[in-house]
Amino acid sequence: TGADTEAVVCVGTACYTAHSGKLSAAEAQNHCNQNGGNLATVKSKEEAQHVQRVLAQLLRREAALTARMSKFWIGLQREKGKCLDPSLPLKGFSWVGGGEDTPYSNWHKELRNSCISKRCVSLLLDLSQPLLPSRLPKWSEGPCGSPGSPGSNIEGFVCKFSFKGMCRPLALGGPGQVTYTTPFQTTSSSLEAVPFASAANVACGEGDKDETQSHYFLCKEKAPDVFDWGSSGPLCVSPKYGCNFNNGGCHQDCFEGGDGSFLCGCRPGFRLLDDLVTCASRNPCSSSPCRGGATCVLGPHGKNYTCRCPQGYQLDSSQLDCVDVDECQDSPCAQECVNTPGGFRCECWVGYEPGGPGEGACQDVDECALGRSPCAQGCTNTDGSFHCSCEEGYVLAGEDGTQCQDVDECVGPGGPLCDSLCFNTQGSFHCGCLPGWVLAPNGVSCTMGPVSLGPPSGPPDEEDKGEKEGSTVPRAATASPTRGPEGTPKATPTTSRPSLSSDAPITSAPLKMLAPSGSPGVWREPSIHHATAASGPQEPAGGDSSVATQNNDGTDGQK
């Protein structure tokens, strides 16, 4: 089935036509497209009102629409496989003619997500209610209908046709009939604006006798952005009505001559245009020819004008409209440039901050500066970045590599560091010996000492621990633990076989090995070399002759 009844509203630079007829969205779009348009957009409240007006016009003519609710396709669709985006006003739908994701929307209800089929939007009209500008048609989303099966299709559709400009409707100075034929093949006798390239047929006179005089005009572009019919003087003037009929077709004043002819005139401060009907201000700026924030500036003697744009904008090709200047094209910034309406701003990359000589300059952020260092221990600033380091006995840890974690020298794949017992401390470790053995001067080996049933050579006193400054790791010295059933460390020293060759007394001293090289205060990460627990001398029967050492922080040998 084709599209039947038709209504038309032209405003600004667009015309909207409303059609009744059960077509699928694809058929409706094709119908609009054949005449050079698309299914209508509804990108703003104003546009919604224009569309509502054309629908109201259609419904006044269309008595056949008896349904309480009526739907009309518009050009908002979502392709198969494209899912709903609730964060956007158009919810992932897009206008068939292209264009940006516009902020205006008027959804009838919350949309359900469905990506498996193409979805189309129609305007939902409640015909039981009067169409009011405050009650704009709601958007209803649903299947797009199927060509050739009217039962699945909705009542009608709205097309939109865009033009470079419009002519004023022809003003008749006497009885007559104007018929406009638009480029989209619609005929109408009443348009508030007539699109460029439309034809006007004027039949002057009253009645259907052959007496009516016909005139033919075309809406042409007379000058850039100036559209008119090329007619001069009022049309269909009739002496019997004089200036009494539609003010003689004149824009302002109508003057009757003695011979029945009459002329149009203008009020002070206005001048008559070439059509001998329309008046324009003598001050060309009074008609607000400049758009988009442009200011109208009068030329010499007030005869012509130029449009001037605010800073950051420039005139477009029409010389009437302002468009944003993309200042970023001139690379005014040292690093990043962001174009903004009427200006721009410079931004710095991560690791840099605004500063330094010149506008838009960036300088390195010293992440290691006092009070802002992100590192737990050592911090080295680099250009645009930094890196952290750890003191001896610690390794970098944490997701971002800013924390330091104690290296447990008593465990690990590197072989035994102590011949007998190994005590891990914060940032270091030391060796100890079982009862009856004493630590040799090398701090690693154990030698047989006087028989003693006291505790093994244990951790040193607090001041002897050799812990580095700046560590964030808790200060605890424990024997290298073995894990208990719940994953809780048990404070059992790691045993190594004691060397029997040493005659050193039993002592307990911190092991200061792997001393850092380089400038003082900068610590090199030590090579990770964990001692494995070596098998020690025969333990007393029962296997729990190991002696727990008391931590200085009061915990039971737990890190």
Epitope: G207, D208, K209, P239, K240, Y241, S261
Partner: antibody
Amino acid sequence: EVQLQESGGGLVKPGGSLKLSCAASGFTFSRYAMSWVRQTPEKRLEWVASISSGGGTYYPDSVKGRFTISRDNARNILYLQMSSLRSEDSAMYYCVRDGNYPDYWGQGTTLTVSS
Amino acid sequence: DIVMSQSPSSLAVSVGEKVTVSCKSSQSLLYSSNQKNYLAWYQQKPGQSPKLLIYWASTRESGVPDRFTGSGSGTDFTLTVSSVKAEDLAVYYCQQYYRYPYTFGGGTKLEIK
């Protein structure tokens, strides 16, 4: 065939009111201006009122403010509402089709204003 | 208002004779835009309503016998009946439709001897 049929005439007291009607057929009524013309007992013809196809109304000073011409394009009827009637309004009232020139006249309806 | 003066007010002629009726307007009825004279002539037979004979001063209405001729321009107009017939007994009126208010001549009563 163009036909114009007036009705509504009669005897009215001075100061009274009356509404005349003219039923039109045989042409596109809405496209024509229409007029009322009266003929006095002395056979003098006087134009009374006109309405253009666009709905504009025109009156001579003698009836302005007292008579109102109107049309119903849907029903093809022309009206003349007369009020504050005077004895000099007594006449035969004709409905006239007034295109580019007045061509067809109805048969007329008589108004008599007398106490 | 435009004043229309018609003469004679009456005349009696024999069948077959030529009749001339004159109509003068107080201002020109010629419209410069279309070069037309906005003048009509009507015939009103006894007991009937007026019937259009001539419009645009010289154009005969369809169905009107060609013995009726209109002429003139501007302010002076003439209706001529070339050869009067008995059925031409009537009152003849001129009317200007150039400008509201429309105005009529006083009429010319044609009688047959």
